[in-house]
Amino acid sequence: ARNGDHCPLGPGRCCRLHTVRASLEDLGWADWVLSPREVQVTMCIGACPSQFRAANMHAQIKTSLHRLKPDTVPAPCCVPASYNPMVLIQKTDTGVSLQTYDDLLAKDCHCI
Amino acid sequence: ARNGDHCPLGPGRCCRLHTVRASLEDLGWADWVLSPREVQVTMCIGACPSQFRAANMHAQIKTSLHRLKPDTVPAPCCVPASYNPMVLIQKTDTGVSLQTYDDLLAKDCHCI
């Protein structure tokens, strides 16, 4: 259940997809990745106010209990709902190879 | 990839399964659930320090970028890796029914 997509905190403040530019050095990949030299990393960032993009029943429960016990139960968290694959050219023992990673770039976000 | 399960912050401080006791009133379910009257809600709570229970490559990237840009990129977040089903006795228009929810109780946790 993808609940409300209206952000009560103002435009762009709630859980959504952001792009962060990162070099191989930033990612700690310089020693095993040849290309690309820079990655447009898509990730999920933003607040998860009550019922905003609630992923499932668990997220709805978490919202209710966070309201009651904010020191014990954290608010839901903005995480990937799905991923886009990414291809890297990697260094290997025998040379180089293409490797596809299915869990590297966020495609869509929700709160859980 | 489930990376390190050793918590550098001290016992019980990192992402793990917690149980929070909640009444139907706490959950806002009193008007549509008959039983159970109280739920032992299992949820994922705790910090996600570098590579602790990293769910996948995305979590590893997030850790690296959070170190570099802590104001822009949040640390990974402790969320359910899997769920246990839970059966509720619900009120319906015609009486009551058993309903199983697959996404209500966290079974296992990871950082993402």
Epitope: S35, P36, Q40, T42, N84, P85, M86, V87, L88, I89, L98, L105, K107 | -
Partner: nanobody
Framework: QVQLVESGGGLVQPGGSLRLSCAAS????????IGWFRQAPGKGREGVSC????????YYSDSVKGRFTTSRDNAKNTVYLQMNSLKPEDTAVYYC????????????????WGQGTQVTVSS
């Protein structure tokens, strides 16, 4: 109209060969890196090979290395994927994509895509 069109797919027995073509119209392939991808039922898109624009360097995934070869014929504005020693696990829809960045071509980036050609390896 700018487009990529794949052809050459079909049904082949294990151990057999196929040659896929990726023909461009409306733009010149010379300046583009060309990636071949495949998508098996219920799976994500996997990068199979890439040929760079400048020096024609080629890159392959471990799963096809030594069996698949990619080449380009700039005069025909076409890139080929020669597939030998085919296995049942090579069964998928095969796509080509063109991108102005160096290899690897990445599926989440907006660039030119073909519509795909089905390859089925079965006895």
């Amino acid at each position: 109209q700018v487009q990529l069109v794949e052809s050459g797919g079909g049904l082949v027995q294990p151990g057999g060969s196929l040659r896929l073509s990726c023909a461009a119209s409306g733009f010149t392939l010379d300046y583009y890196a060309i990636g071949w991808f495949r998508q098996a039922p219920g799976k994500g898109r996997e990068g199979v090979s890439c040929i760079s624009s400048n020096d024609g360097s080629t890159y392959y995934s471990d799963s096809v290395k030594g069996r698949f070869t990619t080449s380009r014929d700039n005069a025909k504005n076409t890139v080929y994927l020669q597939m030998n020693s085919l296995k049942p696990e090579d069964t998928a829809v095969y796509y080509c994509a063109a991108d102005l960045t160096p290899c690897p071509v990445n599926p989440s980036v907006d660039h030119y895509w073909g519509q795909g050609t089905q390859v089925t390896v079965s006895s």
